[in-house]
Interface confidence: medium
């Protein structure tokens, strides 16, 4: 089940998933001047068996200049921030993802991918928060959020984190 909303926004903080639950999708987005290859995958999908999870499909980008017909509209960075985004370069150190059955590791970068990754999370996904550079964390509880299903609706738990200057 897809999570209907984005993880909560915490002022001066970013979130990151350490591993991705099966069913998670990652958009195949290309940086400006590039597009998905013709009939290329729309997204990668975390799939797996009881013993192993991996990403279906590969994202591939090619120069927009090589195509004369249709043009893919790539979201601008300010548009991307409205959706579930995870910055590629994160100062967080991932946990041992191999120890999480039913989860995929962070997919390796593909050539000419967009600067931000757009994930579509599923129920049960956990994301972790940390303060951006120049801010320090005041913890009142776990600095994490989980997508939960309650009464047929999805919601993210509120992370107990305040970032102060």
């Amino acid at each position: 089940e897809l999570c209907d909303d984005d993880p909560p926004e915490i002022p001066h903080a970013t979130f990151k998933a350490m591993a991705y639950k099966e069913g998670t999708m990652l958009n195949c987005e290309c940086k400006r001047g590039f597009r998905r290859i013709k009939s290329g995958s729309l997204y990668m999908l975390c799939t797996g068996s009881s013993s192993h999870s991996s990403w279906d499909n590969q994202c591939q980008c090619t120069s927009s200049a090589t195509r004369s017909t249709t043009k893919q509209v790539t979201p601008q960075p300010e548009e991307q921030k409205e959706r579930k985004t995870t910055e590629m370069q994160s100062p967080m150190q991932p946990v041992d993802q191999a120890s999480l059955p039913g989860h995929c590791r962070e997919p390796p970068p593909w050539e000419n991918e967009a600067t931000e990754r757009i994930y579509h999370f599923v129920v049960g996904q956990m994301v972790y928060y940390q303060c951006v550079q120049g801010y320090r964390a005041l913890h009142r509880g776990p600095a994490e959020s989980v997508c939960k299903m309650t009464h047929g609706k999805t919601r993210w738990t509120q992370p107990q984190l305040i970032c102060t200057g």
Partner: antibody
């Protein structure tokens, strides 16, 4: 429970522009993980995907219609719209809007609206 | 474009029958296939997504199988309300494409 409702002109003259709107209720068009699609079905025929839009405004169109199609979103009104220019009789169809969860399929559909192109 | 070839285009069956509809993709699309049911005058209804996962609220007599290029929708013990047209759809890449449809009517 998310519901979709199409509205717009049921009769369009050839060479004019078809305009339809899909109102989203019971949920936000800004919900993550979904795109918002237009699909059409000519009388007695199969389904044809026209295109879809993210709430951010990023669009993907069917190349066969791309030169004539514009899909836009109005987050303040919780709706998205379809414009199809230079219509001909071949554009006569039932037009559906749908919520698409990519791998997860088009799980919510409008009831459809019939558009006839005729002078 | 990925072409989805659906067979048969129509079939006649009786209540209680087991019915199978197949969809062939023109190239490998993993399990990125969805199945829909459409009744006259109504919008399509999602039955199966991801080739084999039953959509919430859909009776368990419907099942989907296959991956790669070959996919099957099976209806076990056909019920009166199942007489309709069925479509497959690939969600692997744009343009999103549908099969031509299979009309299931009463024998």
């Amino acid at each position: 429970q998310v519901q979709l409702q199409e509205s717009g002109s049921g009769l369009v003259k050839p060479s004019q522009t078809l305009s339809l709107t899909c109102a989203v209720s019971g949920g936000s068009i800004s919900s993550g993980g979904y795109s918002w699609s237009w699909i059409r079905q000519p009388p007695g025929k199969g389904l044809e995907w026209i295109g879809y839009i993210y709430h951010s405004g990023s669009t993907y169109y069917n190349p066969s219609l791309k030169s004539r199609v514009t899909i836009s979103v109005d987050r303040s009104k919780n709706q998205f719209s379809l414009k199809l220019s230079s219509v001909t009789a071949a554009d006569t169809a039932v037009y559906y809007c749908a919520r698409a969860g990519y791998y997860y399929g088009m799980d919510v559909w409008g009831q459809g609206t019939t558009v006839t192109v005729s002078s | 474009d990925i072409v989805m070839t659906q067979t048969p285009s129509s079939l006649s069956a009786s209540v209680g029958d087991r019915v199978a509809i197949t969809c062939q993709a023109s190239r490998n699309i993993w399990s990125y296939v969805n199945w829909y049911q459409q009744k006259p005058g109504e919008a399509p209804r999602l039955l199966i997504y991801g080739a084999s996962t039953l959509q919430r609220g859909v009776p368990s007599r419907f099942s989907g199988s296959g991956s790669g290029t070959g996919f099957t929708l099976t209806i076990n013990s056909l019920q009166p309300e199942d007489f309709a047209t069925y479509f497959c759809q690939q969600s692997h890449s744009t343009p999103i494409t549908f099969g031509g449809g299979t009309r299931v009517d009463i024998k």
